[in-house]
Each structure stands twice: as structure tokens, then as C-alpha cells.
């Protein structure tokens, strides 16, 4: 029995619903009484949802899963996962048994966009050319972990004296804090870019230092 799932991971935003597609080709005369369907976590073998003896056996996974009962007879064994969480990320295996048996695994990739970075400066007054300042770029509640890039006003990458740390909250979402230590020129703009590698989403923040006063666009 051939079981088909998408090759590419299913990308779902945290808090949204995701459909993990799985299909099989029923033979003529197929009835749901013959169908055994099991969805489980690929690595741990934890049961997620099942269908047997002509009946939906329900969710074994936090009551957030559902099948598409009206479409099962046509060979649609897809699973709906509601209110996606970071912890849901991973591989799910769809097992289908009628007379024959088949299985395939589909990957769920969870993502959450990062907030627009907030920029802070230390020290933040009485600055002169030649002073060393610490610029902190903070962006919140994204997933997966971010890449952070710094550049100056001319677009030249700044890679030295950068320290980036990640903090995961109880929901598994990351707060990212990146610190740039730089010696001030006469004036200058310093930008940070926080990139979500899954969503290919870039969040930008910048600070312009023009002697006095400073501006935070």
C-alpha cells in the first residue's frame, strides 16, 4: 500500500492550525470498516491519533488533533493539529493498514516571527568621537533561534566585538539579545538585523549617533 506525504516540511506559525497531509489510494469496494490508521511521533512512537473499526478513536495528543472524517473514504488520512506549539515540532508518521500496510513520515516545522528590535545605548549621553559604546539589540518571542547581523551606515558588516545570547521562555520561544561594542566615529548609524531562518523574515533596528542628540529610528 503506497502512502504519500509531502517531501517538504509543513511550516506552521505558533498558535495557528496545521494540516499534516497523508493520503493513500483505496481500492474499489473499500470501506472504512477495513481501515486502520495511526498517526504517531516518529522518534518516540507516541500515539497521536488513530482510526480503527470504522470509528475515529480520537486524539491521544493533548486533544488538539483531528482527522477529516468525510474525506477518509477517498484516501485522505491527513491530520489537523490545532494551536501549534513549539513542542509539536518534529516528525509525524502516518501508518495506514487495510489489507496491505504502508507508512510515511512528514515533518512539522514550527516558526514564530521576531519582534522589531529595540535598541539601547550605554552610555547614552555626553558621547564624543573615540568613546566606546555598547549597543544592545533585543528582539522577542521568535522561533527558531535567530541569526543576528550588524552593519554600519555604509552597509559594512560589523563582526568583531559582537556577543549574541538567546533565552527560551516556557513556551520555547526565543528572546535574542545582541551586544555590539564599538568606538564612535564623528557620527554613525549602527543597524542590527534579526533573521528568522525558517520564515526568511528579517527584523531591522538601528541607532544613529550624531554627537548630540541621538536618534532611534
Amino acid at each position: 500500500l503506497e502512502v504519500q506525504v509531502p517531501e517538504d516540511p509543513v511550516v506552521a506559525l505558533v498558535g495557528t492550525d496545521a494540516t499534516l497531509c497523508c493520503s493513500f489510494s483505496p481500492e474499489p469496494g473499500f470501506s472504512l470498516a477495513q481501515l486502520n490508521l495511526i498517526w504517531q511521533l516518529t522518534d518516540t512512537k507516541q500515539l497521536v491519533h488513530s482510526f480503527a473499526e470504522g470509528q475515529d478513536q480520537g486524539s491521544a495528543y493533548a486533544n488538539r488533533t483531528a482527522l477529516f472524517p468525510d474525506l477518509l473514504a477517498q484516501g485522505n488520512a491527513s491530520l489537523r493539529l490545532q494551536r501549534v506549539r513549539v513542542a509539536d515540532e518534529g516528525s509525524f508518521t502516518c501508518f495506514v493498514s487495510i489489507r496491505d500496510f504502508g507508512s510515511a513520515a512528514v515533518s512539522l516545522q514550527v516558526a514564530a516571527p521576531y519582534s522589531k528590535p529595540s535598541m539601547t545605548l550605554e552610555p547614552n549621553k555626553d558621547l564624543r568621537p573615540g568613546d566606546t559604546v555598547t549597543i544592545t539589540c533585543s528582539s522577542y518571542r521568535g522561533y527558531p533561534e535567530a541569526e543576528v547581523f550588524w552593519q554600519d551606515g555604509q552597509g559594512v558588516p560589523l563582526t568583531g566585538n559582537v556577543t549574541t545570547s538567546q533565552m527560551a521562555n516556557e513556551q520555547g520561544l526565543f528572546d535574542v539579545h545582541s551586544v555590539l561594542r564599538v568606538v564612535l566615529g564623528a557620527n554613525g548609524t549602527y543597524s542590527c538585523l534579526v533573521r528568522n531562518p525558517v520564515l526568511q523574515q528579517d527584523a531591522h533596528g538601528s541607532v544613529t549617533i550624531t554627537g548630540q542628540p541621538m536618534t532611534f529610528p
Epitope: 516518529t42 518534529g90 527558531p144 533565552m167
Partner: antibody
């Protein structure tokens, strides 16, 4: 069963290089962040480096190895690597490969048996 | 960098006794703390994650508690196989991921 098997350790002189490998099996390797943790003889545990999952290759290092060590992974071979350059006597340790429990929770739920690296003149 | 301080450094107890190990963080780590057991010549083994959740296959005589900066690992009744070194580890703010210095539980 999850298995992590390190290899590549040995005795080298200060300033030399070594490449450690960790062969993983029993789980979907590409779906998990992976780490190297070391333990000097008679000492405690020290995290060395982490690489995130999939092919994003976002890497982190302890200050003590930054600029000298490079972590990488080959998801097609289910293998994690640690390239160690400019080795110092203080790098002498058992190096463990460790799997992150999830991609945002970096506890280490599975460890290899370790491979010993000795840096001595 | 978050520093984890474990106490005591050594704990001498008899089989059947209760062991309480402490781990203090230099700043809050929420509940993002793990405990590991290491026996001589072996790799560490995860016991507890999320401050209080037992890892797969870990006996229920091991329990973790605490949040913020103060954590404890309790072994309700020590078995001969429990004599080992125990480490705590935070994964709240990284890099670096940091470990405590360890507590050695030895037979009295």
C-alpha cells in the same frame, strides 16, 4: 534506541589539530540541535559548542574555544563534527557528543561515551 | 554568564537514606534547569529537566524541585547504584550553557 558514538580522539602536541566525529542513530538527526561537552580529567562538565538543527548551521561556542574550534554537521550522514585547531594543554579532556532535548530546551537527553583528547608536548 | 553553585561538594550517606542536593543560580533561570548523574568512567545521564520532570526511564525516587535561583534534587531512598556525581545545568540564557561544579554522593 538512540546511539551517539564519538571517534577521532588521540594524543597531539600543542598547536596541532584534530577532528572529532559523532555518528548518530535511533532518532531523526536533522531535527535536533547537537552539542559537544567536555570533561577534563578529574574535573566537572564544560559545554563547548552547539549547532542548531536542520541545515541552518547557527553555531555557538564557549569563550575558551572561540576562534579555534568549529562545529559542523552532515545531516545526510547523521554525523556531527568538531574541528579543533591550535590545541592547548588545557583542551585535554574527554569530549562528549550530546543531543539537545529540543531546539529551544538545551538540556542533553542523550550522550555518547566520549572520546579522549590529550594535548601534550 | 549564569553561574551555578552546587552544595554540598560531597555528601556521605548510607543506602536507604534520603539525599538532598542543592543548586543555586547567580540569576533566575526560570524552570530551565536539568540534573545529571555521572558514574566513574561513564557518560552523564539525564535525570531531570524543566526543574522537576523526570527523564524517560528514571526511577521515581529521583525528584527535582525549585524555580528561579534555588533548586534541589532529592533521592528519597538511596540505592547502591545511586552513589555517583550529580551535576545541575541551566539552559535559560546561553551561550554559554553552564553546569554546576557537581556534588559527589558517596557511601558512608
Amino acid at each position: 534506541d538512540v546511539q551517539l558514538v564519538e571517534s577521532g580522539g588521540g594524543v597531539v602536541r600543542p598547536g596541532e589539530s584534530l577532528r572529532l566525529s559523532c555518528a548518530a542513530s535511533g532518532f531523526t538527526f536533522s531535527n535536533y540541535a547537537m552539542n559537544w561537552v567536555r570533561q577534563a580529567p578529574g574535573e566537572g562538565l564544560e559545554w563547548v559548542s552547539r549547532i542548531n538543527y536542520k541545515g541552518y548551521n547557527i553555531t555557538y561556542y564557549a569563550d575558551s574555544v572561540k576562534g579555534r574550534f568549529t562545529i559542523s554537521r552532515d545531516n545526510s550522514k547523521n554525523t556531527l563534527y568538531l574541528q579543533m585547531n591550535s590545541l592547548r594543554a588545557e583542551d585535554t579532556a574527554v569530549y562528549y557528543c550530546a543531543k539537545s532535548g529540543s531546539n529551544s530546551n538545551n538540556f542533553f537527553d542523550y550522550w555518547g561515551l566520549g572520546t579522549l583528547v590529550t594535548v601534550s608536548s | 554568564e549564569i553561574v551555578l553553585t552546587q552544595s554540598p561538594g560531597n555528601l556521605s550517606l548510607s543506602p536507604g537514606e534520603r539525599a538532598t542536593l542543592s543548586c543555586r543560580a547567580s540569576q533566575s533561570v526560570g524552570s530551565q534547569l536539568g540534573w545529571y548523574q555521572q558514574k566513574p568512567g561513564q557518560a552523564p545521564r539525564l535525570l531531570i529537566y524543566g526543574a522537576s520532570t523526570r527523564a524517560t526511564g528514571i526511577p521515581d525516587r529521583f525528584s527535582g524541585s525549585g524555580s528561579g535561583t534555588e533548586f534541589a534534587l532529592t533521592i528519597s531512598s538511596l540505592q547502591s547504584e545511586d552513589f555517583a556525581v550529580y551535576y545541575c545545568q541551566q539552559y535559560y540564557d546561553w551561550p554559554p550553557l553552564t553546569f554546576g561544579g557537581g556534588t559527589k554522593v558517596e557511601i558512608k
